[in-house]
Interface confidence: low
């Protein structure tokens, strides 16, 4: 669910959203660190219905979600796979 990408491409995100996306609507999250041609960190959320949203890295909800996913990925707990975007 949580993926970090280093890419030679420039910034991917033209517009960022801070609107909350429930986790069960999310297929995976890409984190593009600052550098490699882009001056800012980018977070790309891939929804289960195949749409893609760029999320503001400063949005509190995405920071909390990533922290939860990091903790779970470092433990034995499986991370739920949300295949459909529903509450």
């Amino acid at each position: 669910v949580l993926e970090v990408y280093y890419t030679s491409l420039r910034c991917r995100c033209v517009q960022e959203s801070s609107v909350f996306i429930p986790r069960r609507f999310i297929d995976r999250i890409q984190i593009l660190p600052r550098g490699n041609g882009c001056p800012r960190k980018e977070i790309i959320v891939w929804k289960k219905n195949k749409s893609i949203v760029c999320v503001d890295p400063q949005a509190e909800w995405i920071q909390r979600m990533m922290e939860v996913l990091r903790k779970r990925s470092s433990s034995t707990l499986p991370v739920p796979v949300f295949k459909r975007k529903i509450p």
Epitope: V19, F20, P22, R24, F25, K47, N49, S51, E60, W61, R64, L77, P78, P80, V81, F82, K83, R84, K85, I86, P87
Partner: antibody, heavy 122, light 106 residues
């Protein structure tokens, strides 16, 4: 005050297409980070989630019924629709629409319509 | 699909009794479980969301517990107005409901 009201044909014949409407007020689907779902309940007790549409217009379906379902909303942001093709007697049920309000850490089905009864019969 | 197994399907208890209803998920759903009450002829009403959070306006005699695959709804002191059917709902992956528990007063 959030209210939802379902409407439909009441009775229709097998193999036809069922069209349902959910009319709502008290919230804006397009701006409130909300999701409207369709759920049905057969004559027993079971509840079955069918489909949903969210504030961005994204659509979601129950995988087991996906090929027969189409969910949509109107541009005036006061109605959500569900179409079920090739209906069968097994589609006889009470159909509910429900709104899910998204909060920072969860999403909850927090308001339901009263439901509309649909009978499929020849 | 995640399957929710709810038990018992029928429950008869006395006013004042402590009542428990169980839901078991076919796989780990973490805390993504809600409980609903449905009275005859009415739409379901949310009681508990995300395992143990009491929905606004719901009496404190209702509580929820559990995690992972096993969850419980508890009514600490059964009241006549609690006669209804109770459903669990998992919202970890898509949405699936339990089969319901019909609660009556004996």
């Amino acid at each position: 005050h959030v209210t939802l009201r379902e409407s439909g044909p009441g009775v229709l014949q097998p193999s036809k297409t069922l069209s349902l409407t959910c009319s709502f007020s008290g919230f804006s689907l397009s701006t409130s980070a909300m999701v409207v779902s369709w759920i049905r309940q057969s004559s027993g007790m079971s509840l079955e989630w069918l489909a949903a549409i969210d504030w961005e217009g994204d659509k979601y379906y129950n995988p087991s019924l996906e090929s027969r379902l189409t969910v949509s909303r109107d541009i005036s942001d006061t109605q959500v629709f569900l179409r079920i093709t090739s209906v069968d007697v097994a589609d006889t049920a009470t159909y509910y629409c429900a709104v899910m309000s998204s909060a920072d850490s969860h999403s909850v089905l927090d308001a339901w319509g009263q439901g509309v009864s649909v009978t499929v019969s020849s | 699909d995640i399957k929710m197994t709810q038990s018992p399907s029928f429950l008869s208890a006395s006013v004042g009794d402590r009542v428990t209803i169980n839901c078991k998920a076919s796989q780990n759903i973490h805390n993504y479980l809600n409980w609903y009450q449905q009275k005859f002829g009415e739409a379901p009403r949310l009681l508990i969301y995300n395992t143990n959070n009491l929905q606004t306006g719901i009496p404190s005699r209702f509580s929820g517990s559990g995690s992972g695959t096993d969850f419980t709804l508890t009514i600490s002191s059964l009241q006549p107005e609690d006669v209804a059917t109770y459903f669990c709902l998992q919202h970890s992956s898509s949405l699936t409901f339990g089969s319901g528990t019909k609660l009556e007063i004996n």
